[in-house]
């Protein structure tokens, strides 16, 4: 093996020189750094426009961050022989705007995938399942990181972004083994109803820094393994009884609710009662009212029923213009 592609203890990462020779099984692609000892290839901030074809077979951790990939086609990582060891793939910040169906096919060991910070105008429903069958082969993915993948408004498709992401998560029930899902900073206004039902193995769910106003139609009931639920920095006004009961029924969960604009009126009474007795919410004494104005900054835990009133709704005949 040439010195440009072999690795030694004195130089654990070697930048590759472009070579006219046919690719060797353990060659390091141009514009990448490779360490066979660490089973790692880094092609970072190199303005790559496509995935290198000549990735070494030993690669277990592949970093393709900070590039200009634009489109990830079907079989983007399919090789002969396959990259059978590849377990962690980081594509964050690579200007991807389209991930097509089957993009991650033929990666039998892929456990962690990070697509964060890519403006995904199009995410195929079959991006993770690889096929359009109603039940596909289970994906090996255990961790899926999709933070800040929302495209700018002018690049959005007609359909809802929430719906597009949800379709990819539930297609073929391929992600039933997923333990970690990060969906932070995506401007989600709602969480499609059926998504969580298809992800029964989740242990960690991050929905922070979205625009979720309500969880009324979201069911957490079957997430019996859930350990962390991050709902900080959303637009939540109140959690209703159904949601409270579901969260209380999850045996291991810790819920994070900081920085939401809680509305402290009569509809908040059940949530306040629940907060006072639950051990589920982390940092619950940091939760404060945002509305109405007279209640701003009041600590939820310190409220009682007398504090939580609603202005009476006048019958139309008594309303003044």
């Amino acid at each position: 093996t040439s010195s440009a592609s072999s690795s030694s203890s004195s130089a654990p990462f070697l930048a590759s020189a472009a070579s006219a020779q046919p690719p060797l099984p353990d060659q390091c692609p141009a514009l990448c750094e490779c360490s066979e000892a660490a089973r790692t290839v880094k092609c970072v901030n190199r303005n790559l426009t496509e995935v290198p074809t000549d990735l070494p077979l030993y690669v277990r951790n592949l970093f393709l961050t900070g590039n200009q990939l634009a489109v990830l086609p079907a079989g983007a990582f399919a090789r002969r022989p396959p990259l059978a060891e590849l377990a962690a793939l980081n594509l964050s910040g690579s200007r991807l705007d389209e991930v097509r169906g089957g993009a991650f096919e033929h990666l039998p060991s892929l456990r962690q995938l990070d697509l964060s910070h890519n403006p995904l105008a199009y995410l195929s429903p079959f991006a993770f399942s690889g096929s359009n069958a109603s039940i596909s082969a289970p994906s090996p993915l255990v961790e899926l990181i999709l933070n800040h993948i929302v495209p700018p408004d002018d690049k959005r498709q007609n359909r809802s972004f929430e719906g597009m992401v949800a379709a990819a998560l539930v297609a073929g029930r391929a992600l039933q083994g997923l333990h970690l899902l990060e969906l932070a900073s995506n401007h989600f206004l709602y969480l499609p109803r059926d998504v969580l039902a298809q992800l029964p193995s989740l242990r960690y769910l991050d929905l922070s820094n979205n625009s979720l106003v309500s969880l009324t139609y979201v069911s957490f009931r079957n997430l019996t393994h859930l350990e962390s639920l991050h709902l900080e920095d959303n637009a939540l006004k109140v959690l209703h009884n159904g949601t409270l009961a579901e969260l209380q029924g999850l045996p291991h969960v810790r819920v994070f609710l900081d920085n939401n604009p809680w509305v402290c009126d009569c509809h908040m009474a059940d949530m306040v009662t629940w907060l006072k007795q639950t051990g589920v919410v982390q940092g619950k004494d940091r939760l404060t009212c945002a509305f109405p104005e007279k209640m701003r900054n009041r600590v939820l835990l310190e409220l009682n029923s007398a504090d939580l009133d609603c202005d009476p709704i006048l019958p139309p005949s008594l309303q003044t213009s």
Partner: antibody, heavy 116, light 107 residues
């Protein structure tokens, strides 16, 4: 109306400790966080930390851990900040304010001078 | 920690003028930004909370705007009592941090 009344100016020697107070009136004392803010002469504002009087909960700026300690007396609606092992750098005006997402009412400040 | 930067440390304007004071954060803070006024005698008051909401009792001559990392406070029809130092503050993440202040003087 909401008022935060702070204790008077203090002149202390290096190495000593001092306890500043902030008396709250005009609102439900245990229902709001109290914030503490430092301002060195001619400088800007620096957040020290916060306390929730009814529960004893505290959050400190890492920079002030070991320097500042918050306590409260809920029977008299007073929050205290103790500053220990005083140095010249602790000379400042210290403000208390009602928090948390915004500091909507402020005390008038307590001037602490540390001098040998 | 999130750094808050007020690039203009002092500003001179005439009575009746419109003045804009800017503030930038080292990372996005989701509109979690407040503005405070400190008078020469040391008195501190909240003016604007959550980027653009006017605190009760504050004249409507004051307004706030911004998003992401960039925010501003605007005062129209400047009056003598507006002579003060103005501070921005983020409450997105602990520790809460303030800008270095912008001192407003009357020309």
């Amino acid at each position: 109306q909401v008022q935060l009344q702070q204790s008077g100016a203090e002149l202390m020697k290096p190495g000593a400790s001092v306890k500043l107070s902030c008396k709250a009136t005009g609102y439900t004392f245990t229902g709001y966080w109290i914030e503490w803010v430092k301002q060195r002469p001619g400088q800007g504002l620096e957040w020290i930390g916060e306390t929730l009087p009814g529960r004893g909960s505290t959050n400190y700026n890492e920079k002030f851990k070991g320097k500042a300690t918050f306590t409260a007396d809920t029977s008299s609606n007073i929050v205290y900040m103790q500053l220990s092992s005083l140095t010249i750098e602790d000379s400042a005006i210290y403000y208390c304010a009602r928090g948390r997402r915004d500091f909507d009412y402020w005390g008038q400040g307590t001037t602490l001078t540390v001098s040998s | 920690d999130i750094q808050m930067t007020q690039t203009t440390s002092s500003l001179s304007a005439s009575l009746g003028d419109e003045v804009t004071i800017s503030c930038s954060a080292s990372q996005g803070i989701n509109n979690y930004l407040n503005w405070y006024q400190q008078k020469p005698d040391g008195t501190v008051k909240l003016l604007i909370y959550y980027t653009s909401s006017l605190h009760s009792g504050v004249p409507s001559r004051f307004s706030g705007s911004g998003s992401g990392t960039d925010y501003s406070l605007t005062i129209i029809n400047l009056e003598p009592e507006d002579i003060a130092t103005y501070y921005c503050q983020q409450f997105s993440k602990l520790p809460f941090t303030f800008g270095s202040g912008t001192k407003l003087e009357i020309r």
